[in-house]
């Protein structure tokens, strides 16, 4: 079954996908598509890279990480409910029947209706909205949605906990990750 990721309407959604290049700059073609991975390539492609660069992308879909180091995680800007569904990340590892494919399920929730912002809420809004926890592999990865409203003391406490907990693990360890070579 697909790993599930969540975002709110109006937010940017993040779908992790990684590989480790065999050598620096030795890139592998990757495609992202809306819909589960087909037998070859990606269906309904929204972004693709080749051995050198991103060679196709559509509006609102981009790679925020360093794809030259194998971070091919997809960011979808300003999501709407229509962005819900399965997304395919396909890594075309050279060789016979070597492709790695990952189906990620994006769930979009309606935006919360909130009262007029206060200083406390402004600070909350500035706090990172997407946290990723790491289980024992991609199948157990979960992405948390917006954090609940919390006060300054809670933020300080949470920051300390983050520093000492698995939540502080690099995002690289949380998504679909494969090593080449």
């Amino acid at each position: 079954s697909e790993v599930e990721y969540r975002a709110e309407v109006g937010q940017n959604a993040y779908l992790p996908c990684f590989y480790t290049p065999a050598a620096p700059g030795n890139l592998v073609p990757v495609c992202w598509g809306k819909g589960a991975c087909p037998v070859f390539e990606c269906g309904n492609v929204v972004l693709r890279t080749d051995e050198r660069d991103v060679n196709y992308w559509t509006s609102r879909y981009w790679l925020n990480g360093d794809f030259r180091k194998g971070d091919v995680s997809l960011t979808i800007e300003n999501v709407t409910l229509a962005d819900s569904g399965i997304y395919c990340c396909r890594i075309q590892i050279p060789g016979i029947m070597n492709d790695e494919k990952f189906n990620l399920k994006l769930v979009i929730k309606p935006a919360k209706v909130t009262p007029a912002p206060t200083r406390q809420r402004d600070f909350t809004a500035a706090f990172p909205r997407m946290l990723t926890t790491r289980g024992h592999g991609p199948a157990e990865t979960q992405t948390l949605g917006s954090l609940p409203d919390i006060n300054l003391t809670q933020i300080s406490t949470l920051a300390n906990e983050l520093r000492d907990s698995r939540l502080a693990n690099d995002l690289r360890d949380s998504g679909a990750t494969i090593r080449i070579g």
Epitope: V28, P29, C31, G33, G35, A36, P38, V39, F40, E41, C42, G43, N44, V45, R48, D50, E51, N55, Q92, I93, P94, G95, I96, M97, N98, D99
Partner: antibody, heavy 119, light 107 residues
Framework: QVQLQESGGGLVKPGGSLRLSCAAS????????MTWIRQAPGKGLEWISY????????YYADSVKGRFTISRDNAKNSLYLQMNSLRAEDTAVYFC????????????WGQGTMVTVSS | EIVLTQSPSSLSASVGDRVTITCRAS??????LAWFQQKPGRAPKSLIY???SLQSGVPSKFSGSGSGTDFTLTISSLQPEDFATYYC?????????LGPGTNVDIK
Amino acid sequence: QVQLQESGGGLVKPGGSLRLSCAASGFTFSDYYMTWIRQAPGKGLEWISYISGGGGSIYYADSVKGRFTISRDNAKNSLYLQMNSLRAEDTAVYFCARGNWGSAALDIWGQGTMVTVSS
Amino acid sequence: EIVLTQSPSSLSASVGDRVTITCRASQGINNYLAWFQQKPGRAPKSLIYAASSLQSGVPSKFSGSGSGTDFTLTISSLQPEDFATYYCQQYNSYPPTLGPGTNVDIK
């Protein structure tokens, strides 16, 4: 005009070899994945091999695995199928077809080249 | 391997008829189904991809529908040039497989 043209077919004895070519024109060849599909006389269509646009990713049908090799030369806009250890059941018209990377589906087909394996 | 079954295997129809061909997959294939048309001695021609999307240049008298395991190709008004064999193909799972074909001939 987008076009695919196969060549290299002919009569060959069982156990022999043949190399098919598919010349592409009218599009940026390296952007598209390519496949070989065959059709035995009076029969249906059978997919046999896939190669990605850059040539790195390759798939074969079990029926030809270890005997056939797909390759491409993007500088020459050409696709190839090296067929070794040919058998009578490989007798067919061989088509090359272009895969649309945007949808993952086949969109353009060549006219085909006939391969006959017989003693 | 996913097996595709087409029905009918052949049909006779007249010019102007509405013709429907079905393709059933042995397991779910999402919407990764294509339809091809082939005339005797000719190369196949791609008609439909993703179950219902028309390939560029294909007339709108052809339409596709379905998802999961059951799919349909419809020709709204059969013309003389439409008499041919029609194949469905799934490209959801390895290996890609094709149906046995449906031959549409003149009544």
